[in-house]
Structure formats: C-alpha cells, structure tokens
Amino acid sequence: REEAKPYPLFPGPFPGSLQTDHTPLLSLPHASGYQPALMFSPTQPGRPHTGNVAIPQVTSVESKPLPPLAFKHTVGHIILSEHKGVKFNCSISVPNIYQDTTISWWKDGKELLGAHHAITQFYPDDEVTAIIASFSITSVQRSDNGSYICKMKINNEEIVSDPIYIEVQGLPHFTKQPESMNVTRNTAFNLTCQAVGPPEPVNIFWVQNSSRVNEQPEKSPSVLTVPGLTEMAVFSCEAHNDKGLTVSKGVQINIKAIPSPPTEVSIRNSTAHSILISWVPGFDGYSPFRNCSIQVKEADPLSNGSVMIFNTSALPHLYQIKQLQALANYSIGVSCMNEIGWSAVSPWILASTTEGAPSVAPLNVTVFLNESSDNVDIRWMKPPTKQQDGELVGYRISHVWQSAGISKELLEEVGQNGSRARISVQVHNATCTVRIAAVTRGGVGPFSDPVKIFIPAHGWVDYAPSSTPAPGNA
C-alpha cells in the first residue's frame, strides 16, 4: 500500500487536486465499489464539536477574531472483513488567511509516511477552503487494525481530529500453535494453542490423527494435556469464531526410542598399538546421543574371546583405540546410547594393527672373551613373542671400546636366526660394552642394559663371562 504523506495546503486553485465537479464531503462512509461496513459515531448528530480546537491568535486587517478551527465529525468506528477495501476521511474548513498548512495521517500514535493511499482535496471559497483528507486501503489486513487520526499544523498550533477506529475482522489468527515434540512413551505432556479474532470469542477444538479430541470447545488459549502415547501421533487444533475456522499446522509427536546402530564404520588409520575409527551414527531415536561404546575383541579364533570396551562421547564420531597388540587382528563393533538406552552393536568389522618395533630388549645377554680366537662371544634370549610386536628380522649389536683416551662405537647387524654372535676384539687393554636390540620391519626395539667385559693386554688370561640377568633373576 502507499503511505500517507503530509501535503502543503495553499489557498486558491491547486493543480491536480481541485475537483470542481465534486461536492465537498465531510465524511465518506464508504467509497463506491467497497463493501459497506458497520459504522458507529462517537458523537451524537448535530452536537457541537468542542475537542481538538485551535483558536488562532491571528486577526484580519479589521482585527476581527477568527472562529476556532476543528476537524468536522466523521465516522468513529469501521468494522470490516479482512481483504475488503475501506475509505475514510477527515474534513476541515480553513480561512484563506492561512498559508502553508500541512495535514498528515497518524495511526496508533505513529505518523503514516510513505506510499499509503492518502488524497487531500481542496475546495476553495471566498473566505475559507474546505479540505478533505481521504485515506483508503484496498485490501485490509489485520495489521491495519487501529486508531487513525488527522493532524494539521497551523501557526505552530496542532489541530487533531477525533479518532477513526478500524476493526478488521476475519478468521481466527494463531498466535501460538502446537509444537512438534519428542516424548517418552506413556509420559504426559502438554500442547498449547492460542488464536485471536476479531471477532472474539475464539473457540478451540483439538484433533489427534484426524479425530477430534474434545467434544466441547475450549476458549482460546487452550492447553491439551495428553496422558501419554505409545506410538507417534499428529496433533492440530481448530480455531473457530463467527467468521469461520482456521486449522493449525499438524505437529508430529514422536516417541523416544533406543537409537539405531551406526550405518557406517571406517578404519581411518592403524599403527602397531592403535586403530583410529570413525562412524556415522544411525537414527537417534528422537533423543540426542549421549555417548558411544567401542567394543573390541581379538579376531584370532584361539583367543579367549574377552571383549575390551572403550566408552567415549557421542561427538565427534571418532575414536582412537589404544593399547592393542601389534600385528593382530581385531573385530570391532560400535554402539551408541541416548536417554532411552543403547543401540544394538553395529555389524562387527575387521581391523588389524601394523607391525611395530619390539617393545622390549633381548634377555639374558652374556658376553665372554674367546682369547684364542681374539673374539668376543655374545649370547642372548629373544624377547617374548607378545612383545616382539612383529616378525623378528634380526638384531642390532652396539659395542663400545674404551681405553685410555680412546672411545670407539661400532654397530653390527645380525640375522634373525640364532641367538649368538661373535665380534672381533678391536682394542686390547680396554673395556668392551655390549648392548643388543631386536629388529622387526616395524623398527628397532630398545637396547638391552649394557654388559661390560675387560679385554686384557696380550698374554693375560681372563675367561670369566659378563652378563645381564633375565627378568626375575636377581
């Protein structure tokens, strides 16, 4: 719609607005083409109007006082149906002495600016100009409800018309509709519905799965208490007034249930002792996921079948399973829970850890001097199978030779078969320190504790071996 604009008023002819063929109207109950509306006038016909009067202080050349200025009476209350048209007006007679008067329309205390359909017409006479300000709305909406007034400024005085109340009636209008909810099975819950006119009153009927719940209507607002549901239901409310009925949106009330299992599990990464997994959660059962459980069991048929359980938050659907054996096969299942309970476990998936470097050093390292061949013999026990973390490919031997002012480290690689090695004496009258590490394709494990043996000068005899005790042997 166009908004009303203030119009400057000039005495005398006014191009484009003077309608000489138009008899000045002091009130227009309704324009032709509009549906007649009910009208009420707040004042009795013929009663002199006393409100909103401005008595101008200006006098003419003869100093004759001017009559008080006031808007003439018009219709006080218009009731009409939504989408109909309406036209109403204010009229006033202004002595021609006044220049630059402006007239404006106001609604509920706010000036109507912009593109409203407001027309001001001027009907000049010798001494006064009759002004009729018309306001029309082609298709009224509820937002047009309110109190409309005209204001005129004259000599810094403000003249205000009586209000014209516009009441737009129509089908009930919802101010609060029921909301979708997720509820616990057999637990009571409330739904609220509120609708307004005009016209009032507005009565509410509740509908569940297309059937009316209440035989007698309730006055708006209405709260429906549902004692509990065992299955999903759709609720709506009907709002009735004298103009007809309006039906709210249908809302689905879901019953909270245990979630569905995840729909996907991905193996993102594997190391010797960990597996990183992610998952896509299944249907949440109309209740937010709280946490998830990752179940892990060794896939080896000879294992004892015990299940490791790792609990984690529901987000971010990612978990690193740790403390796993290297080079082992695992079955993994994922389950998630909401407030109702746990989902079934996802189908079991297979994942393997990779080969790692051994986690312990060789045991029982023994070193002795074979003086006849000028060699050092070394013996050891391989690490326990479970701590090899892969397939042994050999051993790395570090031997450090120290004598006065000299230190020399050498590394030897030994194949996986056997558990002994022989190294040549590098320096006499020196200490040889030996350490051994197991090697897999996953890397080099930790070195054993150092074992020292003294290599005498040529001619000395010392066959006593040096060794590191095996675990448990003091």
Partner: antibody, heavy 128, light 111 residues
Framework: EQQLVESGGGLIQPGGSLRLSCAVS????????MSWVRQAPGKGLEWIGI???????YSASWAKGRFTISKDSSKNTLYLQMNSLRAEDTAVYFC??????????????????????WGQGTLVTVSS | DAQLTQSPSTLSASVGDRVTITCQSS????????LSWYQQKPGKPPKLLIY???DLASGVPSRFSGSGSGTEFTLTISSLQPDDFATYYC???????????FGGGTKVEIK
C-alpha cells in the same frame, strides 16, 4: 515413510549418455551409504557401485570409467551418470540403501554389509 | 574377482515343502558371515530377507532361516507358502575388495 524413487531411464542410442536419479525420502543421504544395482532382462542382479555418506565412491571393476555415482545431499538425491552406453547395458537400474558399510580409508576400499531398502527401478534400453 | 555360486538354479516345490538353497563362495566372505539373502518377485525390486548369514530382516516370517560361515551358506524355507514362489539371491562382500557379489539366483517355482 522411507522410499526410493528412480527416474531418468528410457531409450538411448549406443554411445550415448544418460543420468539416472534416485529421489530419497524418509531418511538422509548424509547418514547413509547408497548403491546402484542393475538387472538385465531375464538375468540376475549385478552390483554397479556405492557412495558413502561422506561422498567416497567405489565401483565394480567393469563400471570404472564409464559409470559415475554422485549425490546432492541438499536435494536428498542420488545420481548415476552412464557414458558410452552399449546394448549390453540394457537393464532395470535400481538404487538401494546400504544398511551398513565399512570403509578402509587407508586402502581405498569398502565393503557392503546389506542392502536394506530398494527403489522400484527404472528401465534403460540401449538400442539403435 | 570372487564369485558366489547358487544351487540349484531352479527348484520346483509344493506349498508346505521344506526348501533349501545353497550358496558357495570362491573365497571367504568378509568376517565369515557378511552374507545376505534377497527375495525378488517378477517386476518388483529385491527385498532383504537375511543378513549376517542368519539374522532375519525386519518383517520377514520366521519360516525363513539362514546358516553357514566362511564359504558355504544355506537358505531354508521350513514350510513353503504361496507367497514364497520367487527368485532368491545370495550376496556378500570380501576383504580387500569393494565388489559386492550376487549369486546367480535360484528360482523357486510351483511343482
């Protein structure tokens, strides 16, 4: 109600291209992997490929290069783009929801557990 | 590529009969049990009957059962009903391979 509806089938000349669509309702493509399967007249079922919930795709070896699976999660629609069509591609094409899927990201493959919801299928006829 | 072989390819039976269909895989199915059975009627899409070799899908009558592990699987209909005349397919996946293999199908027809 959970439903799959295929469309886009029809008569196409050899060498031509066609894009099939599968409209999904009642569940979200962003939470489920989806698959395409075809069935030549009077023959058995033949798996074409899969797209995971995250958009990773895996195809049967015979379909690689000619058939491409994609999806638009905002429209909840699955697609099968078929190029260089041959007479032996004449079949009813089904889209199906993957009930569960395991992905091995590091090795670029994935395994279907089951196909638990199927569309009615759309017939593609390749003929001159 | 791995293959699933169903036998027999056609089976004639009467209402009330006990029917058994076998499915043999050329290599072990993933996790030894990721094998499913589907039922298809003419002009209709397949319908999931059994997954994990022996778990009944939702809404499937208990007269259907599945068994097996690794490479040998069986679908059994304990007492054939008129609604069961259809074609049955086994299908499964394999480690290290994305392909989802279908068996050639077994048509169960009225004797």
């Amino acid at each position: 109600e959970q439903q799959l509806v295929e469309s886009g089938g029809g008569l196409i000349q050899p060498g031509g291209s066609l894009r099939l669509s599968c409209a999904v309702s009642g569940f979200s493509l962003s939470s489920n992997a989806m698959s395409w399967v075809r069935q030549a007249p009077g023959k058995g079922l033949e798996w074409i490929g899969i797209i995971s919930s995250s958009g990773s795709t895996y195809s049967a070896s015979w379909a690689k290069g000619r058939f491409t699976i994609s999806k638009d999660s905002s429209k909840n629609t699955l697609y099968l783009q078929m190029n260089s069509l041959r007479a032996e591609d004449t079949a009813v094409y089904f889209c199906a929801r993957v009930g569960f899927f395991v992905g091995y990201g590091a090795y670029d493959y994935g395994i279907i557990h089951r196909l638990d919801l199927w569309g009615q299928g759309t017939l593609v006829t390749v003929s001159s | 590529d791995a293959q699933l072989t169903q036998s027999p390819s056609t089976l004639s039976a009467s209402v009330g009969d006990r029917v058994t269909i076998t499915c043999q895989s050329s290599k072990s199915i993933y996790n030894n049990n990721w094998l499913s059975w589907y039922q298809q009627k003419p002009g209709k899409p397949p319908k999931l009957l059994i997954y994990d070799a022996s778990d009944l899908a939702s809404g499937v009558p208990s007269r259907f059962s599945g068994s097996g592990s690794g490479t040998e699987f069986t679908l059994t209909i304990s007492s054939l009903q008129p609604d069961d005349f259809a074609t049955y397919y086994c299908a499964g996946g394999y480690s290290g391979d994305s392909d989802y293999a279908f068996g050639g199908g077994t048509k169960v027809e009225i004797k």
